[in-house]
């Protein structure tokens, strides 16, 4: 007899999670001499052990915590860039500009990067027929609690000046509902991050309208000021360039704005 | 928005019309050059805006060179042909939510002939 | 290249009646509604009419009609006036700051 099984909203488990996950850690920790000391094996159980046999919307932080201490990584905490829907050119950024950071340039960011993952209760199972969806299902998910959780700690770890890359294509330039907006900008610490800067980049159009000046940004510069942190705005117009530039910066035509 | 500087020129004599604005900021507006040819339809040539970026149409790159002042855009004709005698106008761009071409020069008459 | 048709070159109606313009984009036009239309008469500076598809300028009458969204637009003006006889042209913005604009299509009231 067929065993009756949830049906959420999602997507389900992306397929071959296990080995993904195992792969990209043995291949993260070769690329980078600070992390060789890692065992993968141990991170996959302990990457398994926060989601496996629990119920897939009733996931805490503290599941994570033995994956978060495994995983434990010091980058240089002047040198993060955070992002808000524009993940793509943030990463094209960091791979230029190698001495910067994304989440997702972190181990633990890396393995989980546009992955779905969730169990079932009280089976050992992987669920790779659907996962629940943040909005429609529950929002103490395996993967949001993830981001949430890794997040916290990346924004946490932040100091002098931060950097985040914003969509200026967007309605929402700034969302208040996004990881950078409900998580990232809340756990920058004042003590030890002096400004955040953000980089508004235009979409496939350049306009010349400042938005910077956008009330969505004048949002967030209130919700940063208000924590002791001072804020900068700068409009990126011409994303091509502003990458052309950095992999160029001695490019004649890089003296002007970008 | 008002162009300046058509005449009467001879192939291959660069010349510069200018359209000067005012009531508006070009650090924060676009301006468009756009041309027509006598009985013929409206040509884009390329824009300027607030950062200084240039662009062109692909049939207008070398042929034509835009720049701005504070309060002036230039349209550099860097060698006209028969073929660049047109009435040419600068418009200036609307942004987002509201694009298009909403405020229009008179147009300036450039003639080239032999 | 992109390029920006209007179909038809002219167009007649009577006094009262409608005339529809059509402009047709070989690509979809930037955001899908980077399309404006406009009015040309002889000696006068050119007026915009409808900016991003279907937005009336201010001063423009009701009568004047945008619509359409990525590659297909359409111009309508109804209660035809015989102050409407002009040359009609829309324009598109396209994908890394490019812009055209159709053929024009003449308006002729009867």
């Known amino acids: 007899v067929p065993r009756w099984r949830q049906q959420w909203s999602g997507p389900g488990t992306t397929k071959r999670f296990p080995e993904t996950v195992l792969a990209r850690c043995v291949k993260y920790t070769e690329i980078h001499p600070e992390m060789r000391h890692v065992d993968c094996q141990s991170v996959w159980d302990a990457f398994k052990g926060a989601f496996i046999s629990k119920h897939p919307c009733n996931i805490t932080e503290e599941d994570y915590q033995p994956l978060m201490k495994l995983g434990t990584q010091t980058v240089p905490c002047n040198k993060i860039l955070l992002w808000s829907r524009i993940k793509d050119l943030a990463h094209q950024f960091t791979q230029v500009q190698r001495d910067m950071f994304t989440l997702e340039d972190t181990l633990l960011g890396y393995l989980a990067d546009d992955l779905t993952w969730c169990g079932e209760f009280n089976t050992s199972k992987i669920n790779y027929q659907s996962c629940p969806d943040w909005r429609k299902d529950c929002s103490n998910n395996p993967v949001s609690v993830f981001w949430k959780t890794v997040s916290r700690r990346f924004a946490e770890a932040a100091c002098d000046v931060v950097h985040v890359m914003l969509n200026g294509s967007r309605s929402k330039i700034f969302d208040k509902n996004s990881t950078f907006g409900s998580v990232e900008v809340h756990n920058l610490q004042p003590e030890k991050v002096q400004t955040l800067e953000a980089w508004v980049i235009h979409g496939g159009r350049e306009d010349s309208r400042d938005l910077c000046q956008d009330p969505t940004i004048k949002e967030l510069e209130s919700i940063i000021s208000k924590r002791n942190i001072q804020f900068s705005c700068k409009n990126i117009y011409r994303p091509d360039k502003f990458l052309q530039c950095v992999k160029n910066p001695e490019d004649s035509s890089c003296t002007s704005e970008i | 928005v008002e162009e300046s500087g058509g005449r009467l020129v001879t192939p291959g004599t660069p010349l510069t019309l200018t359209c000067t604005v005012s009531?508006?900021?070009?650090?924060?507006?676009?301006i468009s050059w756009v041309r027509q040819a006598p009985g013929k339809g409206l040509q884009w040539i390329g824009s300027?805006?607030?950062?200084?970026n240039t662009y062109y149409a692909t049939w207008a790159k070398g042929r034509f060179t835009v720049s701005k002042t504070s309060t002036t855009v230039d349209l550099k004709i860097n060698s006209p042909t028969t073929e660049d005698t047109a009435t040419y106008f600068c418009?200036?761009?609307?942004?987002?939510?509201?694009?298009?071409?909403?405020?229009w020069g008179p147009g300036t008459l450039v003639t080239v002939s032999s | 290249a992109q390029v920006l048709t209007q179909t038809a070159s002219s167009v007649s109606a009577a006094v009262g009646g409608t005339v529809t313009i059509s402009c047709q984009s070989s690509e979809s036009v930037y955001k899908n509604n980077y399309l404006s239309w406009y009015q040309q008469k002889p000696g006068q500076p050119l007026k915009c009419l409808i900016y991003?598809?279907?937005t009336l300028a201010s001063g423009v009458p009701s009568r004047f009609k945008g619509s359409g969204s990525g590659t297909q637009f359409t111009l309508t003006i109804s209660d035809l006036e015989s102050d409407d006889a002009a040359t009609y042209y829309c324009a598109g913005g396209y994908s890394g700051n490019i812009n055209g604009f159709g053929g024009g299509t003449e308006v002729v009231v009867k």
């Open positions: 009531g508006f900021s070009l650090s924060n507006n676009a």
């Open positions: 418009a200036r761009e609307g942004a987002g939510s509201s694009w298009g071409f909403n405020l």
């Open positions: 991003s598809a279907s």
């Open positions: 300027i805006y607030g950062s200084g």
